[in-house]
Interface confidence: low
């Protein structure tokens, strides 16, 4: 008898009004539910308009919950990025400040007349660290070549040194090693250190960017229907106290977030690679030691040049001929005092150790972010039932939820009873982000071996050479193709291909 079924809609009225909707929509008592499109068609307290409003609201609430979870992760990654970036920039700035403070006294005009060259070198190193399209080896080589020309002129003011003579000097330089081992050592160590530092910071940026972009992926109409049924249909059907069954909620959200879960494998790979590359922050070729000590290599180089001056001059004259004497020029420069060298290995400040241990812990904490998302949202946002299995809302009525919980990812949703998922149509934004994760992981693995990634040229033909040697088993066994660099997020910039190994140059 319909009249006996006609219960009051007071509870629904209260919930619906609390959502900010007009109470004039809500029936005083239950009505027949043939008009319902999402909820089961029994007696109901919801009109068509109410069902539509609640469906839109449940969709928005899930998107908000999703964005909130993403925002927490993004904030963590952004904080990490800022901390590491500040630290690395600080190391380089400290080195430059030390140079500016000590070189004038140590080297006099040999430094002051070339201060711009040193300043520009630090600018280039900063740009390189920040991801600019610089060949670090070329930048350093050009710096040494320019410095040699200038210093040689300064050390021999009594000689006329025209451009063709200086060109000859430049050609002789490689064999003569006027600056000793400093240029080679700095090149080898700086390449490793800067590549490690910038790829780690870029990794944090890419991870954050992926989270941001994925959080913007809209939930489809099938998901909206399923979430409405999960969250509000119990109210419409007169069982407002019944909370969703846990497994029911998980199936709905696994269906809704199927594409997101497909990020899992590459997300883990990226975070693994980031944790691994922090190993390169320590030791004599480590980030802290090298970036903070650039000035000591520069000082060593100038000292070597002064120590080798006579031998160098003799060999240059032998190779390039006797330069003309400058009648107006002063006599040869007096030998200068050696510039005192700061200790090569900077004592670790403890800051980086602290940053790294925090980062490792946090990165490990969020490794399963994408596959744990349905469970997290269900337990934190969906007010799941804690009652016995037969008292929760199963989508049709109060009672036990019988279907099994689906696996993770798109392919596993083929038989999801709650959300109709077309497993043949993966979300393209998420596929692109998976590719970004692969590209960044590949860069980090390359950086682990001390190499900058070999990037394809403008033609986008996909050509590129492999990485150098020294590959670790746990890295090589999972190596990703290095040929997909043209689609990238803001932080995965093309970097010139540099191999850090002696005598091997790929660009």
């Amino acid at each position: 008898d319909p009249a006996s079924k006609s219960r009051s809609c007071g509870e629904v009225r209260q919930i619906y009004g609390a959502k900010g909707f007009s109470l004039s929509d809500v029936p005083q008592a239950e009505i027949s539910g043939e008009h319902l499109r999402i909820c089961p068609q029994g007696y109901t307290c919801c009109t068509s308009e109410m069902e539509e409003n609640l469906a839109n609201r449940s969709h928005a609430e899930l998107e908000t919950a999703l964005r909130d979870s993403s925002r927490v992760l993004q904030a963590m990654l952004a904080t990490q990025l800022r901390s590491f970036d500040d630290h690395f920039q600080h190391l380089l700035n400290d080195s430059e400040r030390t140079l500016q403070a000590t070189f004038p006294g140590a080297f006099g005009e040999l430094y002051t007349q070339n201060a711009r060259a040193f300043r520009d070198l630090y600018s280039e190193l900063r740009l390189y660290y920040r991801g600019a399209n610089l060949h670090l080896e070329e930048t350093l080589a050009e710096f040494w070549a320019r410095l040699l020309e200038r210093l040689f002129k300064q050390l021999h003011p009594q000689l006329l040194l025209p451009d063709d003579y200086l060109d000859c000097l430049g050609k002789q330089a490689e064999a003569l090693r006027p600056f000793g081992e400093a240029p080679r050592e700095l090149r080898l160590r700086a390449t490793r250190a800067f590549v490690a530092a910038r790829s780690f910071v870029q990794g944090l940026g890419v991870a954050s960017d992926v989270v941001r972009k994925v959080a913007q992926v809209p939930l489809g109409p099938e998901c909206s229907r399923a979430v409405m049924k999960l969250v509000y249909c119990a109210h419409c059907l007169g069982v407002p106290g019944a909370r969703p069954c846990p497994d029911y909620c998980r199936n709905v959200l696994k269906g809704c977030l199927a594409n997101q879960a497909d990020l899992d494998a590459e997300w883990r790979n990226l975070l693994d690679s980031m944790v691994l590359i922090t190993d390169k922050f320590w030791g004599t070729s480590g980030v802290e030691s090298v970036i903070g000590s650039v000035h000591t290599w520069l000082a060593e180089a100038i000292n070597a040049l002064q120590d080798n001056r006579d031998t160098l001059t003799a060999k240059v004259i032998q190779g390039c001929g006797n330069p003309k004497v400058n009648p107006q020029g002063p006599g040869p420069e007096e030998k200068r005092r050696r510039g005192k060298l700061a200790p090569r290995e900077r004592p670790p400040s403890g800051t980086l150790e602290k940053l790294v241990s925090e980062a490792k812990a946090q990165l490990r904490d969020v490794q399963d972010f994408w596959i744990s998302l349905p469970g997290t949202l269900c337990s934190e946002k969906m007010a799941l039932s804690t009652a016995s299995d037969d008292r929760c809302w199963n989508g049709m009525a109060r009672g036990r939820y019988l279907p099994e919980v689906m696996g993770d990812g798109l392919a596993n949703q083929i038989n999801n009873p709650e959300v109709e998922v077309d497993i043949t149509k993966p979300d393209m934004t998420i596929r692109q982000q998976i590719m970004q994760l692969k590209i960044m992981t590949n860069r980090l693995r390359s950086a682990y071996n001390g190499n900058d990634v070999d990037f394809q040229d403008a033609s986008d033909d996909g050509s590129g050479s492999g990485s150098g040697d020294g590959c670790l088993d746990d890295l090589c066994s999972r190596k990703v193709s290095r040929k997909s660099s043209s689609s990238r997020t803001p932080l995965t910039h093309a970097l010139p291909g540099l191999s850090e190994q002696e005598g091997q140059k790929t660009s």
Partner: antibody, heavy 125, light 108 residues
């Protein structure tokens, strides 16, 4: 093939505003820095503005700094230049140009242009 | 500023070198590009970008090199159709933006 089609030129009034659009196709637009280069009648090329692949970094030529805004929409593969407070010396052909690669700092954009549009003529009078 | 010679002339088959110098004693690792414009108002064509890279549709007789802050465009075996104005492009540290040279008119 890379195609860059500029539009929005024509006769403009001094003090007014100009909005140029460049529609790109034939390459992965979101991966490349883009920019605008102009040429006054009978004169050389002049850098106007550039923008990095993700839009986060911009640079402007000294003649338009403070009056120009460059922006991009990677979904639509479009590049836009807004130029305010127009002057007679803004007259010329405006070319949309693609850079072969650029990092966050688009500092070397003018050395990396590998494709040009046909240009759109702007007359400020 | 970028300094280019105003004009260069050559006979067909000869090798032509056009230079582009950046001012300042130490210009850092700058990159240079070379852009060809056959007639005023026609769109420029890139012949060299990033110091020495040549687009696939540009003949191999065009090459680029740099030494310090000077870039050189070399056309080996110049042909009549190479007659054009050539602009170099680079980076201007003072304005922190792009810059072009005034152009060199090549007459063959």
């Amino acid at each position: 093939a890379v195609t860059l089609d500029e539009s929005g030129g024509g006769l403009q009034t001094p003090g007014g505003a100009l909005s140029l659009v460049c529609k790109a196709s034939g390459f992965t637009y979101s991966s490349y820095a883009m920019g605008w280069v102009r040429q006054a009648p009978g004169k050389g090329l002049e850098f106007v503005a550039s923008i990095s692949s993700d839009g986060s970094d911009t640079a402007y030529g000294s003649a338009v700094k403070g009056r120009a805004t460059i922006s991009r929409d990677n979904r639509q593969s479009t590049l836009r230049l807004q130029l305010n407070n127009l002057r007679a010396e803004d007259t010329g052909t405006y070319y949309c140009a693609k850079s072969y690669r650029c990092s966050w700092n688009c500092w070397d954009y003018a050395a990396k242009i590998d494709a040009w549009g046909h240009g759109t003529e702007v007359t400020v009078s | 500023a970028l300094t280019q010679p105003a004009s260069v002339s050559a006979n067909p088959g000869e090798t032509v070198k056009i230079t582009c110098s950046g001012s300042g004693s130490y210009t850092g690792s700058y990159y240079y590009g070379w852009y060809q414009q056959k007639s005023p108002g026609s769109a420029p064509v890139t012949v060299i970008y990033n110091n020495n890279k040549r687009p696939s549709d540009i003949p191999s007789r065009f090459s680029g090199s740099t030494s310090g802050s000077t870039a050189t465009l070399t056309i080996t075996g110049v042909q009549a159709e190479d007659e054009a104005v050539y602009f170099c492009g680079s980076y201007d540290r003072s304005s922190d933006s792009g810059i072009f040279g005034a152009g060199t008119t090549l007459t063959v």
